[in-house]
């Protein structure tokens, strides 16, 4: 899923307030939610019909410093005899999540919302027509 | 997948440097790869075997304002005759994400990060036991 | 118009291992998975595997799992294949050939192909 | 592997002629492609979903079949056809390719 442009209007003062200096806003620390119960994920990248794979990336300068990326394992789907149905496609499912990037000069430190395409995991689907004409 | 907890360190100051003052950071306007493209959804959740809706939620004081959440539409999977298979289970794809939170009192505008859990798709898996014992 | 264009031929002792190139032009290349054929002399055609460069999805034939390895680079959209361990019977034209995109049409769906490589294993 | 027998193997006929290519597969399969291969040259789909033609082929070519017997025909034989031909099974893990009929003219 796509996230909407921002406009930059989400960042502004009401029009009746001094503008923001400088281009920048006021970020208070720490996260809400941060503790939320996130219920385990019991292995469905091995067990789904559209098998994944999980690749790490990892950047220090980056909040969350680990993103996880999946990849689909097979170009077909798995049926019950284990093996792969070449009438199905495994195909990724992808969402644009925010991360925040950190940039430092000395003791001056900055941050900024940057937009990220995980691949979240994979869903077997029956393409539209079969064959290409 | 989860993100990691902050532990507050990625956004303080090097430890040489004077700690951040009001407890708040500087977020610079803008957001990096805003315009990144994002290919068609191609409508894979009406064309998969663990077919999914969405419902929209929205909030004006969040960025995105929009967050789409999927509901897996059965809990068999469609099998190749469009019939659900029970022996098969339809299972939600979750994704923690991140949100800005804007507060305001007046002309005094501050932002602050959000973890959101967001169902973003379905998969279809073989049930790890298939009875209760 | 969709263009595929694979590297020269090759000539490799047995042992050594050999990486075909596959320069895909006038598409989007994440969007299509690509496949790749061998044909031996006087040999019919075989259908080695396929991978997805979007999804990092592959698919081989058992026939040459541990032989062939498949990959691309998506900024450079181009598909590889590496053959490892060349025997003799790995003589051979290989073919890469583009698949559907796996949502209109199935990844297994071959419509455009590539011009060849020969590989000879010869000592 | 399901696997795919053609034939004849090779076969000689003159311009004009009806010309009938069998493939027959061990077991049975949903779809079934046709491909030409000239000399020298890449094969090209000529027949995909048993009986469609593919686009830019001409109608003398045509494709039937089901279960594991599928034929492709070509209606009046010219000399640009002179070349293999290949059926392939679209219905199971991996794709499965005949052995080849080479055609030529008499």
């Known amino acids: 899923r796509k996230i909407p442009k921002v406009g930059h209007t989400f960042f502004q003062k009401p029009e009746s307030c001094p503008p923001v200096p400088g281009g920048s806003m006021k970020l208070d620390i720490g996260i809400i939610n941060e503790n939320q119960r996130v219920s385990m994920s019991r292995n469905i990248e091995s067990r789904s019909t559209s098998p994944w794979n999980y690749t790490v990336t990892w950047d220090p300068n980056r909040y969350p410093s680990e993103v996880v990326q999946a990849q689909c394992r097979n170009l077909g789907c798995i049926n019950a005899q284990g093996k792969e149905d070449i009438s199905m496609n495994s195909v990724p499912i992808q969402q644009e999540t925010l991360v925040v990037r950190r940039k430092h000069q000395g003791c001056s430190v900055s941050f900024q919302l940057e937009k990220v395409l995980v691949t979240v995991g994979c869903t077997c689907v029956t393409p539209v027509i079969h064959h290409v004409q | 997948r989860k993100i990691p907890k902050v532990g507050h360190t990625f956004f303080q100051k090097p430890e040489s440097c004077p700690p951040v003052p009001g407890g708040s950071m500087k977020l610079d306007i803008g957001i990096i790869n805003e315009n990144q493209r994002v290919s068609m959804s191609r409508n894979i959740e009406s064309r998969s075997t663990s077919p999914w809706n969405y419902t929209v939620t929205w909030d004006p004081n969040r960025y995105p304002s929009e967050v789409v959440q999927a509901q897996c539409r059965n809990l068999g999977c469609i099998n190749a005759q469009g019939k659900e298979d029970i022996s098969m289970n339809s299972v939600p794809i979750q994704q923690e994400t991140l949100v800005v939170r804007r507060k305001h009192q007046g002309c005094s505008v501050s932002f602050q990060l959000e973890k959101v859990l967001v169902t973003v798709g379905c998969t279809c898996v073989t049930p790890v036991i298939h009875h209760v014992q | 118009q969709v263009q595929l264009v694979q590297s020269g031929a090759e000539v490799k002792k047995p042992g050594a291992s050999v990486k075909v190139s596959c320069k895909a032009s006038?598409?989007?290349?994440?969007?299509?998975?690509m496949h790749w054929v061998k044909q031996a002399p006087g040999q019919r055609l075989e259908w080695m595997g396929g991978i997805n460069p979007n999804s990092g999805g592959v698919s081989y034939n058992q026939n040459f799992k541990g032989k062939a390895t498949l990959t691309v680079d998506t900024s450079a959209s181009t598909a590889y294949m590496e053959l490892s361990s060349l025997r003799s019977e790995d003589t051979a034209v290989y073919y890469c050939a583009r698949g559907g995109d796996g949502y209109y049409t199935n990844y297994f769906d071959i419509d455009y192909w590539g011009q060849g490589t020969t590989v000879t294993v010869s000592s | 592997d399901i696997q795919m027998t053609q034939s004849p193997s090779s076969l000689s006929a003159s311009v004009g002629d009806r010309v009938t290519i069998t493939c027959s597969a061990s077991s049975s399969v949903n779809y079934m492609h046709w491909y030409q291969q000239k000399p020298g040259k890449v094969p090209k789909l000529l027949i995909y979903d048993t009986s469609k033609l593919a686009s830019g082929v001409p109608s003398r070519f045509s494709g039937s079949g089901s279960g594991t017997d599928f034929t492709l025909t070509i209606s009046s034989l010219q000399p640009e056809d002179v070349a293999t031909y290949y059926c392939?099974?679209?219905?199971?893990?991996?794709?499965?390719f005949g052995q080849g009929t080479k055609l030529e003219i008499k």
């Open positions: 006038g598409y989007t290349f994440n969007e299509y998975t």
């Open positions: 392939q099974q679209w219905n199971s893990h991996p794709l499965t």
